[in-house]
């Protein structure tokens, strides 16, 4: 089977959503956990993560082969404390298989804005607190 993990971010007003999406087959969901770590280059695990989620066992319909499971970590107001390196990972508690997504970073600037870099879908995202828009 093939399990794919991607990272993305979205902004809703002052909130920043960090999203880990895993695409997988039904039969691959058993025992799999997706999790998001911060500043954990070597020991990212469900136990040290910011949030974890078990993969869906059911896509909700029967006419599809793949399921997407989505972990969303919401930062209500980004502060300098949120600056750092983040990574989406997944692990099977049955087989021990580990998946590691690309590292991405939040950089809080002196002007009160923040930048998210390293995301594969959008190479560079900049968010402004003052205007609350994607800049």
């Amino acid at each position: 089977g093939c399990i794919n993990i991607t990272s993305s971010a979205s902004q809703e007003g002052t909130r920043l959503n960090l999203i880990c999406t895993v695409w997988h087959k039904k039969e691959e969901a058993e025992g799999f956990v997706v999790f998001l770590c911060k500043d954990r280059s070597g020991d990212c695990s469900p136990e040290t993560s910011l949030k974890q989620l078990r993969l869906k066992r059911d896509p909700g319909i029967d006419g599809v082969g793949e399921i997407s499971s989505q972990l969303m970590f919401t930062i209500s107001q980004v502060t300098p404390l949120h600056s750092g390196t983040y990574q989406c990972c997944a692990r099977s508690q049955k087989s021990g298989i580990r998946l590691q997504g690309h590292f991405f970073s939040i950089l809080f600037t002196e002007t009160g804005n923040y930048t998210v870099t390293g995301l594969k879908q959008r190479q560079h995202l900049e968010f402004s607190h003052n205007e609350g828009t994607l800049s």
């Epitope: 078990r54 909700g60 319909i61």
Partner: antibody, heavy 121, light 107 residues
Framework: QVQLVQSGAEVKKPGASVKVSCKAS????????MQWIRQAPGQGLEWIGS????????RYTQKFRGRATLTADKSTSTAYMELSSLRSEDTAVYYC??????????????WGQGTTLTVSS | EIVLTQSPATLSLSPGERATLSCRAS??????LHWYQQKPGQAPRLLIK???QSISGIPARFSGSGSGTDFTLTISSLEPEDFAVYFC?????????FGGGTKVEIK
């Protein structure tokens, strides 16, 4: 045993909103899709949408997108369906129902008792 | 959206007779079809899953068949408690949809 217990009957005025709850017990709430279905008096069954409480993935039929909001509270194993901008045509019995695990059951194997919504000025 | 068309809308039969209910899908849905029974004032009850698979606790007189676009629910010998409304429902794709229902009434 699996049980879905819904909130009581509601009477609302046109333009108002309603939030119906469905408390689940007897199974792992986060592992199953919860459906919301309605039935107008003397009519058939109409699927509104469904939510997967494990990751809050929600799907809606086009007719209700933007007017219905499905949520789930993992801590209390309760699913909610909020319907806004109510009109008289929304008068119906609203059901929550659990979808059985794919390829094993697939259909809606457990149903709530139904919540009657009356929209009248 | 997959449209499910049930026929007939009403079926008038006597106890002991055989009932044959039809459900037709607007496009192929493999065997991803389920049947429900609903009695007045009650929530629907799952009768048959995946077109032909039986459900624990449902009498053996209820059976289902079909695949693709044409499906049939058969009640081999109607009992008094079987007079009700029957719905089909597809789980092949979003949005999930129901058929309009067939009412089985006493002749």
């Amino acid at each position: 045993q699996v049980q879905l217990v819904q909130s009581g009957a509601e009477v609302k005025k046109p333009g108002a909103s309603v939030k119906v709850s469905c408390k689940a017990s007897g199974y792992t709430f986060t592992d199953y899709w919860m459906q919301w279905i309605r039935q107008a008096p003397g009519q058939g069954l109409e699927w509104i949408g469904s939510i997967y409480p494990g990751d809050d993935d929600a799907r809606y039929t086009q007719k209700f997108r933007g007017r219905a909001t499905l949520t789930a509270d993992k801590s209390t194993s309760t699913a909610y369906m909020e319907l806004s901008s109510l009109r008289s045509e929304d008068t119906a019995v609203y059901y929550c129902a659990r979808r059985g695990i794919a390829a094993v059951v697939g259909g809606f194997d457990y149903w709530g008792q139904g919540t009657t919504l009356t929209v009248s000025s | 959206e997959i449209v499910l068309t049930q026929s007939p809308a009403t079926l008038s039969l006597s106890p002991g007779e055989r009932a044959t209910l039809s459900c037709r899908a607007s496009q192929s849905i493999s065997n991803h079809l389920h049947w429900y029974q609903q009695k007045p004032g009650q929530a629907p009850r799952l009768l048959i899953k995946y077109a032909s698979q039986s459900i624990s606790g449902i009498p053996a007189r209820f059976s289902g068949s079909g695949s693709g676009t044409d499906f049939t629910l058969t009640i081999s010998s109607l009992e008094p408690e079987d007079f009700a409304v029957y719905f089909c429902q597809q789980s092949n794709s979003w949005p999930l949809t129901f058929g309009g229902g067939t009412k089985v009434e006493i002749k």
